[in-house]
C-alpha cells in the first residue's frame, strides 16, 4: 500500500480550525491477525529523510495521537487529552485519515507527517508516511479562510519508508 | 486516559473454576488485541492468552485446553474461565491491551488455588 | 516455543550506564519490547519494537538489536531505575518473555 497526501502547503489565517488529510491507497489486506497503526507528529525539513525526525504536535507524542484498527475501518481519537489540546485524528472507511487543528497560532506553523504501519501479529510489516507544510499567517496578509495547495502527482502518493 | 480494571480473583480449590473480567474504558476496545498475561510470586511473567480485535484466540500451548478467553465489546470487557485449577496457576493476573508490545496493563487480581 | 534469556541480575551506580540482555537463537526479524516492573506494582512498557520507547519513557531508556540478541541500555542510572526488567517477543502467535534481570542501584 501507499499513503497519499493530497495537500502538501496548507496556509491558514491564525484562529482557524483546519484538517490535514492523508489516503491510503492499494490494496489493503484484511487478514485477522492484520491491523494498521496510524498517527501524526510533526518533523523539520533539514533532514536527510524527510519525517525521520517525531516531534510532539502541541505537547503530544504520536503515541498519544495514534489510531489502530482492521483493514479500512472507521476509527477516532476518544481520549480527552487530544481533544484539550484542540487535537482531532480520524479514519474512515476508504482510507482516509486526518487530524484536526483547532484555534490555531503562529506556534503551529511547520512541516507535519502521517504515518501508517501495517502490524501482521504485533509485527510491523510495512510502514509508510507522507508530509505536508502548515503555515499559519497574521495580519493583514493572511487569507481569512485556509487556503490549500494540492501535491505535485510525485508527491501525493508519498511512499517512502518511516 | 487508558484504564484497565480485573476483577473477579480469590481463593479457589484444585479443581475448581473462576472467571476473571477486565473493564476496559478510555479507548477503543474493539479495535485492539487484548491479552492475560500471569506472574506467580515471586516469579516471572508468563503470557496466558490473546484475543484479537476480530476476535481470533491464541494461547499458551501449556494452558489451552484448561483457559478460554473472550470478549464483549458491546461492555468492554474481556474474561478468561479458567476450569481444572491447579495450586501452579496460583498468580496475579494481569489484563492488557497489545499493539506491538503490551501497551496498558490493569493492576493485576490475584488466584490463589489452594484446599 | 522458544526461550528468550536474560542475565538474572545486573548493577550499578548512580550515573553510570548499564545493559540488560536478552537473547535468543531464533529472533529473526521479529520485534523484541521492554518492560519494567517496580517492586509491588503492574509492569510498563518501557520500549517496543525493539527501540522506540513508549509514551512517557525518558530518553535515558533505549533499546537496540542486533542478530540473535537484543539490548536494554539506561544511562545516567537513578535509583528509582531499581526494578525488574523483562524483554518480550511474538513467536508466530505466541507471547514470549525473558525470564528477568533484577537491577540494582548501589
Known amino acids: 500500500f501507499k499513503v497519499a497526501t493530497p495537500y502538501s502547503l496548507y496556509v491558514c489565517p491564525e484562529g482557524q480550525n483546519v484538517t490535514l488529510t492523508c489516503r491510503l491507497l492499494g490494496p489493503v489486506d484484511k487478514g485477522h491477525d492484520v491491523t494498521f497503526y496510524k498517527t501524526w507528529y510533526r518533523s523539520s525539513r533539514g533532514e536527510v529523510q524527510t519525517c525521520s525526525e517525531r516531534r510532539p504536535i502541541r505537547n503530544l507524542t504520536f503515541q498519544d495521537l495514534h489510531l489502530h484498527h482492521g483493514g479500512h475501518q472507521a476509527a477516532n481519537t476518544s481520549h480527552d487529552l487530544a481533544q484539550r489540546h484542540g487535537l482531532e485524528s480520524a479514519s474512515d472507511h476508504h482510507g482516509n485519515f486526518s487530524i484536526t487543528m483547532r484555534n490555531l497560532t503562529l506556534l503551529d506553523s511547520g512541516l507535519y507527517c502521517c504515518l501508517v504501519v501495517e502490524i501482521r501479529h504485533h509485527h510491523s510489516e510495512h510502514r509508510v508516511h507522507g508530509a505536508m507544510e502548515l503555515q499559519v499567517q497574521t495580519g493583514k496578509d493572511a487569507p481569512s479562510n485556509c487556503v490549500v495547495y494540492p501535491s505535485s502527482s510525485q508527491d501525493s502518493e508519498n511512499i517512502t519508508a518511516a | 486516559e487508558v484504564q484497565l480494571l480485573e476483577s473477579g480473583g480469590g481463593l479457589v480449590q484444585p479443581g475448581g473454576s473462576l472467571r476473571l473480567s477486565c473493564a476496559a474504558s478510555?479507548?477503543?476496545?474493539?479495535?485492539?488485541?487484548m491479552s492475560w498475561v500471569r506472574q506467580a510470586p515471586g516469579k516471572g511473567l508468563e503470557w496466558v492468552s490473546e484475543i484479537s480485535h476480530s476476535g481470533t484466540t491464541n494461547y499458551n500451548p501449556s494452558l489451552k485446553s484448561r483457559f478460554t478467553i473472550s470478549r464483549d465489546n458491546s461492555k468492554n470487557t474481556l474474561y478468561l474461565q479458567m476450569n481444572s485449577l491447579r495450586a501452579e496457576d496460583t498468580a496475579v493476573y494481569y489484563c492488557?491491551?497489545?499493539?506491538?508490545?503490551?501497551?496498558?496493563w490493569g493492576q493485576g487480581t490475584l488466584v490463589t488455588v489452594s484446599s | 516455543q522458544s526461550v528468550l534469556t536474560q542475565p538474572p541480575s545486573a548493577s550499578g551506580t548512580p550515573g553510570q550506564r548499564v545493559t540488560i540482555s536478552c537473547s535468543r537463537e531464533?529472533?529473526?526479524?521479529?520485534?523484541v519490547h521492554w518492560y519494567q516492573q517496580l517492586p509491588g506494582t503492574a509492569p510498563k512498557l518501557l520500549i517496543y519494537d525493539n527501540n522506540e520507547r513508549a509514551s512517557g519513557v525518558p530518553n535515558r531508556f533505549s533499546g537496540s538489536k542486533s542478530g540473535t540478541s537484543a539490548s536494554l541500555a539506561i544511562s545516567g542510572l537513578r535509583s528509582e531505575d531499581e526494578a525488574d526488567y523483562y524483554c518480550?517477543?511474538?513467536?508466530?502467535?505466541?507471547?514470549?518473555f525473558g525470564g528477568g534481570t533484577k537491577l540494582t542501584v548501589l
Open positions: 518480550q517477543a511474538w513467536d508466530s502467535s505466541t507471547a514470549v
Open positions: 492488557t491491551r497489545a499493539i506491538w508490545g503490551f501497551d496498558y
Open positions: 531464533n529472533i529473526g526479524s521479529r520485534s
Open positions: 478510555g479507548f477503543t476496545f474493539s479495535n485492539y488485541a
